[in-house]
């Protein structure tokens, strides 16, 4: 969490951003909130990016003002216009790419004063893993697959019964570059699996951590998976 305050001149207002991560090939949100003003026409929102000459986005007098917008953000940005009045200056970014990573500044002017806060935006790829029993294998084997990750993640297997066990000797992980030559498909195979046990395939990079669980019994197979973004620090 980054909390910024205004500088000299008029009164300062509090602006708060949250460091976040964008999944390339999806829309992303850069979070920013501020002390609201009662009059929309008095609010100015400017988003800037370190190293970029033009503005990322500008909203003033109740509408978008994009004449100074940098070419790399043309057609891609939006604020939530109906939520500006309640202090939401968050930015929606269409079709996030690796090059969108960097330091952004959310700069606010209201009738109460000015304020700004920086935001670190990371970009990469992350996806939910799916764990299945590999019936083609000669022994009891599990196969964990996740379609798109970047940067290259680590994959660790764990089991409920053998807690703390190191499965690196009985697992094999491969990374296959996807057709767009950025993201990679993750495939990890775990050998010598025992029945009546729950196994977890954990995939992690500096942006996200995802886990796929599978419980194999004689009568059924239960699966569960979840994904968590790692770097949600507010400022």
């Amino acid at each position: 969490l980054i909390i910024g305050f205004g500088i000299s001149g008029r009164h300062s207002i509090t602006v708060t951003t949250v460091a976040s991560a964008g999944n390339i090939g999806e829309d992303g949100i850069l979070s920013c909130t501020f002390e609201p003003d009662i009059k929309l026409s008095d609010i100015v929102i400017q988003w800037l990016k370190e190293g970029v000459l033009g503005l990322v986005h500008e909203f003033k007098e109740g509408k978008d003002e994009l004449s100074e917008q940098d070419e790399m953000f043309r057609g891609r940005t939006a604020v939530f216009a109906d939520q500006v009045i309640v202090g939401n200056a968050s930015l929606r970014l269409k079709n996030v790419q690796l090059t969108d990573a960097g330091t952004y500044k959310c700069y606010i002017i209201t009738s109460k004063g000015k304020g700004n806060a920086n935001l670190e935006y990371k970009t990469g790829a992350f996806s939910m893993p799916e764990v299945n029993v590999d019936y083609n294998a000669s022994s009891e084997t599990l196969r964990c697959e996740a379609p798109r990750w970047f940067p290259q993640p680590t994959v660790v297997w764990a089991s409920q019964v053998d807690q703390g066990a190191n499965f690196s000797e009985v697992s094999n992980t491969s990374f296959e570059l996807n057709s767009e030559n950025v993201t990679m498909k993750v495939v990890s195979v775990l050998y010598n699996v025992t029945i009546n046990n729950t196994y977890s395939c954990m995939i992690e990079n500096d942006i996200a951590k995802a886990t796929g669980d599978i419980k194999v019994t004689e009568s059924e197979i239960k699966r569960r998976s979840h994904l968590q973004l790692l770097n949600s620090k507010a400022s």
Epitope: I24, E26, R74, D82, R92
Partner: antibody, heavy 116, light 109 residues
Amino acid sequence: EVQLVESGGGLIQPGGSLRLSCAASGFIVSRNYMNWVRQAPGKGLEWVSVIYGSGRTDSADSVKGRFTISRDNSKNTLYLQMNSLRAEDTAVYYCARDGDYGMDVWGQGTTVTVSS
Amino acid sequence: EIVLTQSPGTLSLSPGERATLSCRASQSVSSSYLAWYQQKPGQAPRLLIYGASSRATGIPDRFSGSGSGTDFTLTISRLEPEDFAVYYCQQYGSSPLYTFGQGTKLEIK
């Protein structure tokens, strides 16, 4: 040259299935938001489905549960699997790339007629 | 659900005249996500304007877009014979994800 070419349209009976294809050249499908848009005879444009660069998909309520958008990255091709077809699905179906600057590349369209 | 309403439904003008087409949204639309398309009979639509006011590649400068919030305008400063067609506005980002207006037919008077 950046191009999209649709195929797979035809005459189909109500309740039937059809798969449309859209072959892309000059750009990588999986880096863009790829869409299917349709136009019923004498009517306006109606958005049908999108597949994001990430592979996630979304569809209009009118086709949810019946139509499935997908892509084959190795073939650089977009698909629309249409099941449980109805008379109101009769239209010209276009695939379109939504680059950063709107739907800037369109195919020539393929005609789907649903009739008994 | 966001609805885009275009007016007029049909616009009858002569070559050389100025055309003003309107697109009104039922709720606020980001300027970045508002586009205009031209469609001629038997052809696929063609992107004219993106980001409410930026001309797409190869589009003549007689076409211009303006507006913000809920009211957007496409202006053709001096009509050429090839400009007579149907024009659609389109938004991105709300539910449904993409929405088109019903179209304005620009015909020769």
